[in-house]
């Protein structure tokens, strides 16, 4: 996930936000799956 060639603060911010969103979605799916399997 290189996400482009820009290293300015806005590009870094958008990349960080994307990672957070992605992790939240993945963890959310895992949590739902765990609840479903109980």
């Amino acid at each position: 996930h290189s996400d482009g060639i820009f290293t300015d603060s806005y590009s870094r911010y958008r990349k960080q936000m994307a990672v957070k969103k992605y992790l939240a979605a993945v963890l959310g799916k895992r949590y739902k799956q765990r609840v479903k399997n109980k």
Partner: antibody
């Protein structure tokens, strides 16, 4: 380079999917954005998609448009189209929109 | 959504002269510098000139200069050439990307 396709004449309410493909660059390593421009008007930011597949949209989109991606393409799915959506649609690379395609024209008319 | 207000069109300049285009945002951009400038010629897609308020994009001539911070930004073209006749747009990036928006554009006419 990047190139858009899928633009055509549709009637109001018809869904339409636009596709952005690349030659000579690996799209999967870049965030990609969509921008539109109505005939004779200015540019309008639609939204973008990160390399992780997470998306952000302009507030005016109101859930009518969806951006998604595969390893080789980026798509813009549009629903509930109205005549106001008539425009040339561009895809562009990076959050700063550093490399643009030539655009694809979408005409919404009854 | 943010509103970006640009210098009204058209702006006229003589070859070799200087053009100044202003872009004012209704709210501060991210980190006070998340603003880009684009050049668009008729029938062509836009081209990135400046990003992060003042950083020149790859391959862009040094006669283009971006400045400003927060809500007020300026694009200056020094030693204007005929090839600079185009419409110029600013784009603001914000804490909430849902606010991201372009300015209305400023047409530059070169005499």
């Amino acid at each position: 380079s990047v190139e858009e396709s899928g633009g055509r004449l549709v009637t109001p309410g018809t869904p339409l999917t636009l596709t952005c493909t690349a030659s000579g660059i690996d799209l999967s390593g870049y965030a990609m954005g969509w921008v539109r421009q109505a005939p004779g008007k200015g540019l309008e930011w639609i939204g973008d998609i990160s390399t992780y597949g997470t998306t952000d949209y302009a507030s005016w989109v109101n859930g009518r448009f969806t951006i998604s991606r595969t390893s080789t393409t980026v798509t813009l799915k549009m629903t509930s189209l109205t005549t106001e959506d008539t425009a040339t649609y561009f895809c562009a690379r990076d959050y700063w929109l550093s490399l643009w395609g030539p655009g694809t024209l979408v005409t919404v008319s009854s | 959504a943010a509103v970006l207000t640009q210098t009204p069109s058209p702006v006229s300049a003589a070859v070799g002269g200087t053009v100044t285009i202003k872009c004012q945002s209704s709210q501060s951009v991210y980190d006070n510098n998340a603003l880009a400038w684009y050049q668009q010629k008729p029938g062509q897609p836009p081209k990135l000139l400046i990003y992060a308020a003042s950083t020149l994009a790859s391959g862009v001539p040094s006669r283009f200069k971006g400045s400003g911070s927060g809500t007020q930004f300026t694009l200056t073209i020094n030693g204007v050439q005929c090839d600079d006749a185009a419409t110029y747009y600013c784009l603001g990036g914000y804490d909430d990307p849902a606010d991201n928006a372009f300015g209305g554009g400023t047409e530059v006419v070169v005499k």
